[in-house]
């Protein structure tokens, strides 16, 4: 059965300077491969967070993703700025070796609205 990626909120609003959580769950960790968050779509999409050990300022995982059966890949963005506004996608990849990972499923997206303080 194909993995499903669920982003339950279609949109969230957050005041500038505050934090927000973007929720994402998957139905399976197989096929093996990373999960990443992007803002935007297509060639211009921006990598926001990857669950592959790198450090991303202002962004943290919400659950303990070191659990071998973890299916929750939600993130918390701290100190939100107006530049953080946009639509965020949680994307499941199948691992590639000696070639790029292959995107196999994306969540429906969560639009982040940043309100002035």
């Amino acid at each position: 059965t194909e993995v499903k990626v669920t982003q339950p909120e279609k949109s969230v609003s957050v005041a500038a300077g505050d934090s927000t959580i973007l929720n994402c769950t998957v139905t399976s960790l197989l096929p093996v491969g990373p999960i990443r968050w992007y803002r935007g779509v297509g060639q211009s999409r921006l990598l926001i967070y990857s669950f592959t050990g790198e450090h991303f300022p202002r962004i943290r995982n919400v659950s303990d993703t070191t659990k071998r059966n973890n299916m929750d890949f939600s993130i918390r963005i701290s100190n939100v700025t107006p530049e953080d506004a946009g639509t965020y996608y949680c994307v499941k990849f199948q691992r590639g070796s000696s070639e790029p990972d292959t995107e196999i499923q994306s969540g429906g997206g969560t639009e982040v609205y940043v309100l002035a303080k």
């Epitope: 197989l30 096929p31 093996v32 990373p34 050990g53 303990d64 070191t66 659990k67 691992r95």
Partner: antibody, heavy 118, light 107 residues
């Protein structure tokens, strides 16, 4: 620099218990899953147990389930392996290892020798 | 179980390939661990199929496809003599496994 230092090994009799410790430094211990791996004399590597970063989830190879318990104390930057009902087959060098995001290992300790002998 | 050759040998400067089979590409990630003497601390030379830690020389590389992984040492050196263990993590069973090890002799 990442450092993992095991301790607690020694000579014990069959049926006895032993607790191994692994002191971690040079990284944010509470952010990483950890594992124990052993190597019997003249043999290869054998994974024994793993534990999630928060310590709530543990995983074991079938042959040690019920006899070995992995645990951790994040404020003390320490990993433990409680071993009971030891037999001669448990004689080995025991290593602690830090896990990567996908549960392979990137750093290893120097190991501590456990000898089970009557 | 992961299967790898018991031994390989090469002359300095040659390219060495060590294969590891028995995993499932759908569910298994691979790593390679170097042990220079029995009982000494293993060193990770490749993890996540093809990722090389920053302190490992660039002559070490890895790949995976189908049910096999390969460790490649390009321009092997005498100091690369060691036992190389293939390791796998199976996302279906949540279990780590190792191959029996391959002894690399540099002539």
């Amino acid at each position: 620099d990442v450092q993992l230092v095991e301790s607690g090994g020694g000579v014990v009799r069959p049926g006895e218990s032993l607790r191994l410790s692994c002191a971690a430094s040079g990284f944010t211990f509470s952010s990483y899953a950890m594992s124990w791996v052993r190597q019997a004399p003249g043999k290869g590597l054998e994974w024994l147990a793993g534990i999630s970063a928060g310590g709530s989830d543990t995983y074991y190879i079938d042959s040690v389930k019920g006899r070995f318990t992995i645990s951790r104390d994040n404020p003390k930057n320490s990993l433990y392996l409680q071993m009971s009902s030891l037999t001669a087959e448990d004689t080995a060098v025991y290593y602690c290892a830090r896990e990567t995001w996908n549960h392979l290992f990137d750093y290893w300790g120097l190991g501590t020798l456990v000898t089970v002998s009557s | 179980a992961l299967t790898q050759p018991a031994s390989v040998s090469a002359n300095p400067g040659e390219t060495v390939k060590i294969t590891c089979s028995g995993g499932d590409y759908y569910s298994t990630y691979y790593a390679w661990y170097q042990q220079k003497s029995p009982g000494s601390a293993p060193v990770t030379v490749i993890h996540s199929d093809d990722k090389r830690p920053s302190d490992i020389p660039s002559r070490f590389s890895g790949s995976a496809s189908g049910s096999a992984a390969t460790l490649i040492i390009t321009g092997v050196r005498v100091e690369d003599e060691a036992v190389y263990y293939c390791g796998g993590y199976d996302g279906r069973t949540y279990i780590n496994t190792f191959g029996a090890g391959t002894t690399l002799t540099v002539l």
